[in-house]
Amino acid sequence: ELNDLANHRMFSFHDGGVQISCNYPETVQQLKMQLFKDREVLCDLTKTKGSGNTVSIKNPMSCPYQLSNNSVSFFLDNADSSQGSYFLCSLSIFDPPPFQEKNLSGGYLLIYESQLCCQLKLWLP
Amino acid sequence: ELNDLANHRMFSFHDGGVQISCNYPETVQQLKMQLFKDREVLCDLTKTKGSGNTVSIKNPMSCPYQLSNNSVSFFLDNADSSQGSYFLCSLSIFDPPPFQEKNLSGGYLLIYESQLCCQLKLWLP
């Protein structure tokens, strides 16, 4: 199921910035999603559950995000996404076991002079 | 116990490079230790155990390392450690449960002209 996750639109554009969507299987209950810009961790979101199914979200890098039951979307301004960077969604699954780490979708994003002019996407296997 | 781990010498110097020590509690049996250079993951080491207490080590970034029952030391050459970078040890504890993630010690390291001249350490709480 994890291998199917690359077949989605990773980048979408809104005023002044970029939304980067990182999909994961709906069966995953507890996870960490990291967004890499080249080798740098740009965003880091961890969702865990307490004994009463209460949900805890940790977002130490304070990235604007949106979380659903099968995706995490991070919102970047153009400064974060310029210079033709390679972005990668990296998923750690805590629950259900076993613990797994997967590099999901990845793509190049090129923005010139704050105009969203070109987008070249390369999907990782 | 995790809060006591900052009270150790994080950096030590040897010919041509730096040893960065990331301490963890002796009670931790299965773990992942990541070394961050600023926001970049420089090293990533995972230790898990089999049924007969055999140990499996995964080191996908092929960092030279030394592992004991309470620390992981990564060996970097000066190229990796130059330009006044901030280094951080990040620990994920798998065993004993429950799963935890902790940022351990962190410190700035400044190296000029391959001479180990100054070291300013800032310990994170």
Partner: antibody, heavy 121, light 106 residues
């Protein structure tokens, strides 16, 4: 849906051999340590042995009661676990369960419904 | 091999009663102890792992405590559906089960 289905049980004479299979589906079989546990009629649970994952070189470990007579193997490409039982004794009569366990980062296991092995002359 | 003992071997209690089972290991197993429930004709079900952590979907009336060699399993308020045999299991070194405790209703 997670499933572990044991097969291969039946009646065998003392000194004979039998091979049990356990077909797994619905989870990542190759990531789990696979155990065999047995239960003699009206008795308690008894651990038989385990085979670890590829990361641990498929290491096997056995209880003293079966060591040297039983062999556990696995085929990750077929999602199947095996138990080869040789030199069977009457006291090996039991329901044999295969179980899949993992301990990182949560202890977790799946059990099959078991297959009955009867050793009798 | 690590040996596990359990007591009592059986008990009868009323609905709503607090039920306690003890388990002892022949050597220090730290907290690597789990508890299973088995109903007649069924496979065992994991209730508790690492001495006191509840497995997913297990009601909070079940609890565990202890460390080292001495462990306790408690049902705070016995329900009719709790009629079963309960086993402790060490997983510090391979696996060993206790002999079981059969719980029924008075």
């Amino acid at each position: 849906e997670v499933q572990l289905v044991e097969s291969g049980g039946g009646l065998v004479k003392p000194g004979g051999s039998l091979r049990l299979s356990c077909a797994a589906s619905g989870f990542t079989f190759s990531d789990y340590f696979m155990h065999w546990v047995r239960q003699a009629p009206g008795k308690g649970l008894e651990w038989v042995g385990v085979i670890d994952t590829k990361s641990f070189n498929y290491a096997t470990y056995y209880s003293d009661l079966v060591k040297g007579r039983f062999t556990i193997s696995r085929d990750d490409s077929k999602n199947t676990l095996y138990l080869q039982m040789n030199s069977l004794k009457t006291e090996d009569t039991a329901v044999y369960y295969c179980t899949a366990t993992i301990a990182v980062p949560y202890y977790f296991d799946y059990w099959g419904q078991g297959t009955l092995v009867t050793v009798s002359s | 091999d690590i040996q596990m003992t359990q007591s009592p071997s059986s008990l009868s209690a009323s609905v709503g009663d607090r039920v306690t089972i003890t388990c002892q290991a022949s050597q220090d197993i730290s907290n690597y102890l789990s508890w299973y429930q088995q109903k007649p004709g069924k496979a065992p079900k994991l209730l508790i792992y690492y001495t006191n952590l509840l497995a997913e979907g297990v009601p909070s009336r079940f609890s565990g405590s202890g460390s080292g060699t001495d462990f306790t399993f408690t049902i705070s308020s016995l329900q009719p559906e709790d009629i079963a045999t309960y086993y402790c299991q060490q997983y510090y070194n391979y696996r060993t089960f206790g002999p079981g405790t059969k719980v029924d209703i008075k």
